[in-house]
């Protein structure tokens, strides 16, 4: 159990106050946290409060402000980018948003040796990706989608891709499919390690469906924004990897690299590359059917001038029980003899584990075992190897740092973070500099968020770089709602759920509950993480119980529960929070009477088919920008879980596991539909469809869209949707306003 | 020992077609890109196209954009231009030439090409 | 396009005696995109400066390049008779590749 200190004691109790809804929207109660931007092994650079770039050297001591907030504002700047060489600095300005990771910016190149900016042969704008080279100062970036390389900053520029053209032809930039479901980042470039080569993908969009939607604007007509997206069975893109050398980049011009050939003979996708030396590159595949992948190791033959990659250094990853790897494929982390490497997939008994790969698959060194998982591989040095896992104390969803020592036989496990501070600690990330001379641990609760500084051979905490005082100080006199980490055991499967309790909860009464759900394949809700949120308040003010329940698709507790929606989506996700629900009955503190469902995107379209699973247990229900047919959603992602909407596959539960098939059900339950009209992601169209069919059913609900916003509804949509739901709660559950 | 051999050059009527075709040997064809040069009885040179080593990217100069295609079968060691729609200001002795923007390390013979009514 | 100039058009010079060329581009090209080539009457161009100012291979070391930017200069410290020829340089930072209008190095 997870209990927040309660500090309500009857002599402050008229000090102490609830949280209000105008707290969660102010983001009065947000924390800090402090990632270090590391440049050596004992360096970093960070940000001031007052936005001067300074300089941390951890062995000196001493501290030096690189760029100042005058030459940052002189520009604009809201972002920055330190030359490998410390000779140059970008600036970037001018930021402006296009889907979840990318955007376009204006970019600026300031010359520290002079204390001047770069006059001519300046960057064009807007640019779509910009970065310096691992060493030196050589550019490379990404112009209306094609690439181009600068040997110095003043230098004119080297176009290396000219077919780049609109919602066609990107190079060295994802589409929207990939940035969003593949790769997870805006760049689809990557320096080898001394900046020799260049690797960069195309993606050719040309023959893919295009989702046109109306922004509104404030013109007297609407634009309309056309974007490739390969919804579920389309044609997808075609991608091919490119390397050029960077040191003579016009005599040979870019080379592509081979595909292994069982990946080329049927659609596929590249998943992600990784420099291992200047001269060989790890790449990834995955077959369309993404159960199978390839791992393909490739060297450069300075005879040929080409990019070799043998069969011999192929290495294959299947799941016979679901899809390869977790959310994604598992990328590798090669050891010092750049050709085996360590990575994380799922040993015999169905839990991710880190593995040692030095021929073959088959021959891998389990490194890592148990009824737990390895989520992260941070660092391999000579001598350790740095990584996540849930292992402590057998709670899923916590996170604590482990380092394994590799040099020494038999290696040896030690936990870095999992005494820290125990109470307040239970969930960590890692940075680490170069070498692991040094790490940072950024804390996410369940207590006060904190980042700390640490050497990295002994593990001896050395400062502590951001303790979130202020917020700690300023929610001494607030009523925080208790919070409850604990499992249930249903018919052999373990659900855990975390409950968040009113400050003044009594066993005794009866309490409204609220179950906040995502339960997206591959995800986690209950996580041992601090937060002030939305139903924070709900608890704290309103007196309702909230409860996240971490049901089978989800992640991090072994393949069984992971790969149980393996081709059925929207059945096993509804049926568990359903059964934890019946279970929060049991337990005598829920008002039955009064229950109610909601969640965003993947758990819109849970709660939708939950409120619509004819239980009568839930009373009323809110789904924002939801999935209501998986036949609407993005093809990488949706297929990966359901295979394809064709006959001779999975057509039938494609049909089977739509909201609109179930609109009949939503006659008895309050339902609240919101959506953003500009939703790149999960198109409004879902939730055009469920309308249709509930008007169609003449079933009376509630709708709210929100005009030109996409599937994060932020601004001042925030602010209006949170109200809406609130007011939407209150009114199901008879609470007073 | 690295060659380039072209062939194919001759006189053509104006608006007529010509290929051309570059043999290569004494290095690994596939892995570099080629490229076509002209030069014009008694002027300088002026590029014409080139083809990155799969074949996979084309890039041709402004003046013979839409009449001229290149091509490659590595599978025979050999570069073509297929020049459609031949004007007079197209008569030059065609090169071919390893590299793709330059330098161009390596230079065929050169076959001329001769349009004239 | 990139337009490159070359001065003098033609070079009258005796064997033994050292040979400036030079080369202007219309915009920056840097050392790191230009080369220089030699042709000889019905012969192709041969490669003599590589990139980045480099001989290529099999070059004599009298022939040298130099230059940055828009300005860029081949030299030939000692002529020798199977010097005297049409020199061009090229840029190859930008499509189309262009080249200069070529120097003719001939005999005093």
């Known amino acids: 159990i997870v209990l927040r200190p309660s500090r309500v004691h009857n002599s402050e109790e008229n000090t102490m106050r609830a949280l209000t809804l105008k707290d969660i929207l102010n983001g009065t109660f947000s924390y800090k946290t402090f990632f270090p931007n590391w440049i050596s092994g004992q360096e970093y650079l960070h940000q001031s409060a007052d936005n001067n770039i300074v300089l941390y050297n951890i062995e000196t001591g001493q501290s030096y402000t690189i760029l100042s907030n005058r030459t940052m504002k002189s520009v604009n700047a809201s972002n920055y980018g330190l030359s490998p060489d410390r000779q140059f600095v970008y600036l970037e300005s001018d930021y402006s948003k296009l889907w979840r990771y990318s955007y376009t910016a204006t970019y600026y190149i300031y010359d520290l040796s002079n204390g001047e900016f770069v006059r001519g042969n300046e960057l064009p704008r807007p640019i779509q990706y910009l970065c310096w080279s691992p060493v030196g100062s050589k550019l490379a970036y990404v112009y209306q989608n094609n690439i181009y390389l600068k040997q110095r900053p003043g230098d004119p520029p080297f176009q290396i891709t000219f077919n780049g053209r609109e919602n066609k032809i990107f190079n060295g930039i994802p589409d929207w499919v990939y940035e969003e479901e593949m790769l997870a980042t805006k760049y689809a470039l990557w320096w080898s390690p001394n900046g020799k080569f260049l690797a960069y993908a195309e993606f050719n969009d040309t023959d893919i469906p295009v989702i046109a939607y109306s922004y509104y604007g404030d013109e007297q007509y609407p634009r309309t924004i056309n974007i490739p997206y390969p919804k579920a069975g389309a044609k997808n893109p075609v991608v091919r990897i490119f390397i050029i050398d960077t040191t003579y980049p016009a005599y040979v011009g870019p080379q592509e690299v081979p595909v292994p050939a069982m990946i080329a003979s049927s659609d596929y996708y590249f998943s992600w590359l990784t420099w291992v030396t200047d001269e060989r590159v790890c790449l990834q595949w995955l077959k369309r059917v993404q159960n199978v992948s390839v791992l393909s190791i490739c060297d450069f033959r300075e005879d040929w001038q080409t990019w070799d990659c043998p069969k011999t250094q192929e290495h294959i990853e299947e799941s016979r029980t679901g899809w390869a790897g977790g959310f994604f494929v598992s990328t590798p982390v090669f050891s010092y003899d750049a050709i085996s490497y360590y990575k994380i997939f799922s040993d015999k008994d169905g839990y991710k584990h880190i593995h040692y790969i030095k021929d073959t698959v088959e021959n891998a060194i389990q490194i890592t075992s148990g009824k737990w998982e390895a989520i992260n591989i941070f660092r391999v040095t000579q001598d350790s190897l740095f990584y996540s896992s849930n292992e402590f104390e057998e709670y899923p969803g916590r996170r604590n740092i482990y380092r394994i020592s590799i040099g020494s036989y038999p290696p040896s496990k030690k936990c870095v973070t999992c005494h820290l501070r125990k109470e307040r600690c239970q969930y960590y990330t890692a940075s680490f500099s170069d070498y692991a001379k040094y790490y940072a641990l950024v804390c996410y609760g369940p207590g006060i968020p904190i980042s700390t500084l640490h050497d990295g051979r002994t593990d001896q905490e050395i400062k502590i770089l951001e303790e979130n005082k202020e917020l700690e100080n300023a929610l001494k006199n607030i009523q925080l709602p208790k919070e409850e980490i604990k499992k249930l055991e249903v018919d052999e499967i373990t659900l855990w759920y975390k409950m968040i309790l009113p400050p003044q909860f009594d066993r005794s009464k009866k309490y409204p509950l609220l179950i906040q759900v995502y339960g997206g394949p591959c995800s986690q809700s209950v996580r041992s993480v601090f937060a002030v949120n939305w139903i924070s308040y709900l608890a704290s003010k309103e007196g309702m119980v909230i409860a996240l329940v971490d049901g089978r698709g989800t992640a991090f507790q072994g393949d069984k529960l992971l790969y149980a929606v393996y081709r059925k989506l929207g059945v096993y996700e509804v049926e568990d929070q359903i059964t934890a629900v019946r279970k929060f009955i049991e337990m005598g503190f829920i008002d039955e009477k009064r229950i109610a469902i909601w969640g965003w995107s993947y758990g819109g379209y849970v709660s939708s088919l939950a409120l619509a699973s004819g239980t009568g247990l839930f009373k009323c229900g809110i789904a924002v920008a939801p999935v209501s047919s998986w036949e609407y959603y993005a093809s990488v992602y949706t297929e990966r879980f359901m295979g394809l909407p064709t006959k001779d596959d999975n057509l039938e539960h494609y049909k089977n596991s739509t909201v609109m098939a179930r609109a009949e059900y939503f006659r008895n339950v309050d339902y609240l539909l919101i959506h953003g009209t500009a939703d790149d992601n999960v198109h409004f169209q879902n939730s055009a469809q469920i309308a249709k069919a509930l008007v169609n059913a003449q079933v009376d609900f509630q709708a709210m869209w929100y005009s030109d916003q996409n599937h994060g509804l932020s601004g001042l949509s925030t602010n209006h949707l949170y109200t809406h739901m609130t007011h939407f709660l209150k009114q199901c559950f008879s609470l007073s306003d | 020992e690295v060659q380039l051999l072209e062939s194919g050059g001759g006189l053509v009527q104006p608006g007529g077609s010509l290929r051309l075709s570059c043999a290569a040997s004494g290095f690994t064809f596939s892995s570099y890109a080629m490229s076509w040069v002209r030069q014009a009885p008694g002027k300088g040179l002026e590029w014409v196209s080139a083809i990155s080593g799969s074949g996979g990217s084309t890039y041709y100069a402004d003046s013979v954009k839409g009449r001229f295609t290149i091509s490659r079968d590595n599978s025979k060691n050999t570069l073509y231009l297929q020049m459609n729609s031949l004007r007079a200001e197209d008569t030059a002795v065609y090169y071919c030439?390893?590299?793709?923007?330059?330098?161009?390390?390596?230079w065929g013979q050169g076959t001329l090409v001769t349009v004239s009514s | 396009e990139i337009v490159l100039t070359q001065s003098p058009g033609t070079l009258s010079l005796s064997p033994g005696e050292r040979a400036t060329l030079s080369c202007r581009a219309s915009q920056s090209v840097t050392s790191s995109y230009l080369a220089w080539y030699q042709q000889k009457p019905g012969q192709a161009p041969r490669l003599l400066i590589n990139?980045?100012?480099r001989r290529a291979t099999g070059i004599p070391d009298r022939f040298s390049g130099s230059g940055s930017g828009t300005d860029f200069t081949l030299t030939i410290s000692r002529l020798e008779p199977e010097d005297f020829a049409v020199y061009y340089c090229?840029?190859?930072?930008?499509?189309?590749?262009?080249f200069g209008q070529g120097t003719k190095v001939e005999i005093k």
């Open positions: 030439a390893k590299g793709w923007l330059g330098p161009f390390d390596y």
């Open positions: 990139v980045g100012s």
């Open positions: 090229q840029q190859g930072i930008m499509l189309p590749p262009t």
